[in-house]
């Protein structure tokens, strides 16, 4: 806590400008009016304040807004955002996507910090659901964002938002998460034709049930091995050799190199040797 001291004569700040970088911490506390700071927050980022000076500016805003900052201030926090604690952020009510983008930009290139996680949580809860624009924004900054959500949180994602999801956004999702996302993707893409549908649904297939895989096998989709290896074992096991052959097309040749790995290993063990022999790969059940 900075001690309350009177502002020296002639040092009262009329505006937020570069001259303030020469102020000592106590001078900033005494000479910068919190209301002035709040209205000119957009200038703070252009001035090379030290971390200690930023601490003083934050303290002034905390005093002015003990219940939490208004969005007009939050949007212009810039690097001051890095000084905020999750407790500070929980007091905020962020509703504008522009505000969210501005703060995520500050943290760009770094891991998701507790502050950012809290900010996103507040924003999404405020909106009531993870809409397409929000998802677009979040996955652009954090490709792994979607897979960091629990299945319960993912259940609030409307099918329309699925259009914003890119294949790399699902790279770290586990089967439980894909179980939630797959039905939404199926609904979102249901009006697309066969080949276009497969391109879109492919990344979500780790949540697909057996009957959907059987249906895909009738559509000449040529699923690659990387996708096949991510399918649920329990969904793959009931597939016949003929269905797997149709599902994979030319990619079926890749089964040999994967014969010791799940789900291929478990699937092979379920098949009749005569059927496996038809694949021409020397697979042993």
């Amino acid at each position: 806590e900075v001690e309350k001291t009177a502002c020296p004569s002639g040092k009262k700040a009329r505006e937020i400008d570069e001259s303030l970088i020469f102020y000592k911490k106590w001078e900033l506390e005494a000479c910068v009016d919190a209301a002035l700071l709040a209205t000119q927050m957009d200038r703070v980022n252009a001035i090379p304040f030290t971390y200690e000076q930023l601490d003083v500016l934050k303290h002034k805003l905390d005093e002015l807004y003990p219940q939490g900052y208004p969005e007009s201030v939050i949007q212009h926090l810039g690097y001051l955002f890095l000084k905020m604690s999750p407790e500070d952020i929980r007091k905020w009510n962020v509703t504008s996507l522009e505000t969210l983008k501005a703060l995520l930009e500050v943290n760009k290139g770094h891991e998701m910090s507790p502050q950012v996680a809290t900010l996103i949580d507040r924003f999404v809860k405020g909106r009531g659901q993870l809409d397409k624009d929000t998802l677009d924004t979040l996955t652009a900054f954090y490709p792994g964002y979607l897979c960091s959500l629990s299945p319960e949180e993912l259940s609030s994602v409307p099918p329309s938002s699925i259009w914003a999801v890119r294949p790399q956004d699902l790279d770290t999702c586990d089967p439980r998460q894909l179980d939630v996302l797959y039905p939404k993707a199926r609904l979102a893409f249901q009006n697309m034709n066969g080949s276009e549908y497969f391109v879109k649904i492919q990344s979500f297939l780790g949540g697909a049930p057996t009957e959907d895989l059987k249906a895909l096998s009738q559509q000449n989709v040529s699923m690659d091995l990387a996708t096949f290896m991510k399918l649920r074992t329990d969904a793959v096991l009931p597939l016949t050799v003929a269905e797997v052959q149709k599902l994979l097309g030319p990619h079926v040749e890749g089964l040999k190199a994967e014969e010791r790995h799940r789900p291929v290993r478990d699937w092979i063990l379920r098949q009749r040797q005569d059927d496996l022999d038809t694949l021409g790969l020397g697979l042993q059940g």
Epitope: H251, V252, E253, G254, K256, A257, T278, G280, L281, G282
Partner: antibody, heavy 121, light 107 residues
Framework: EVQLVQSGAEVKKPGASVKVSCKAS????????MHWVRQAPGQGLEWMGN????????YYNERFRSRVTMTVDKSTSTAYMELSSLRSEDTAVYYC??????????????WGQGTTVTVSS | DIQMTQSPSSLSASVGDRVTITCKAS??????IAWYQQKPGKAPKLLIH???ELQPGVPSRFSGSGSGTDFTFTISSLQPEDIATYYC?????????FGGGTKVEIK
């Protein structure tokens, strides 16, 4: 010892067809798909397609799909590649090749000696 | 289809020189690339698979490196018997594709 022995050189007229054979020995024929690769004079290698020797299902390079037919005869462990509607640019050496499935879709570790097909009027 | 762009198309080097050939894939192929040597009138001979794994009996002067889309094949000290054309092959996709080849000659 694994061996792939191909049929002899052929000279064909434009518009005709050619059928090249590749007899495999030294391994279980039905455990490895057979691939065909061609090489025009002074040019690079071009993958033409492959065939499952167990039930004869082929997959072709789009470039040849309308003109190529790959077949197998399991009883003699022989693979065949037939190319129809021949033109001068089909003059090339045609190779059969067997993949090794150590990783992914497999690289070619054994090759036939090649069959020269000359298309000339 | 995956395109494999190989360079240079030809090179001339002295015995003992270090020779480097590159192959660039049009999409990520992990490390699924093989390198072949082909001498006139002969079938290609496998030298390296999975980017850097040397085939048994292949001299250690041959090596490979890379991953994703960019790959390098190196002959650390060129020998007269290395005069040949070298090809890369991607097998990350069942529809295999070769690079255009690099003809290596002695100065």
């Amino acid at each position: 010892e694994v061996q792939l022995v191909q049929s002899g050189a052929e000279v064909k007229k434009p518009g005709a067809s050619v059928k090249v054979s590749c007899k495999a020995s030294g391994y279980t024929f039905t455990n490895y798909w057979m691939h065909w690769v061609r090489q025009a004079p002074g040019q690079g290698l071009e993958w033409m397609g492959n065939i499952n020797p167990s039930q004869g299902g082929p997959y072709y390079n789009e470039r040849f799909r309308s003109r190529v037919t790959m077949t197998v005869d399991k009883s003699t462990s022989t693979a065949y590649m037939e190319l129809s509607s021949l033109r001068s640019e089909d003059t090339a050496v045609y190779y059969c090749a067997r993949p090794y499935y150590g990783s992914s879709y497999g690289y070619f570790d054994y090759w036939g000696q090649g069959t020269t097909v000359t298309v000339s009027s | 289809d995956i395109q494999m762009t190989q360079s240079p198309s030809s090179l001339s080097a002295s015995v003992g020189d270090r020779v480097t050939i590159t192959c660039k894939a049009s999409q990520d192929i992990n490390k699924y690339i093989a390198w072949y040597q082909q001498k006139p009138g002969k079938a290609p001979k496998l030298l390296i698979h999975y980017t850097s794994e040397l085939q048994p009996g292949v001299p250690s002067r041959f090596s490979g490196s890379g991953s994703g889309t960019d790959f390098t094949f190196t002959i650390s000290s060129l020998q007269p018997e290395d005069i040949a054309t070298y090809y890369c092959l991607q097998y990350a996709n069942p529809l295999r594709t070769f690079g255009g080849g690099t003809k290596v000659e002695i100065k």
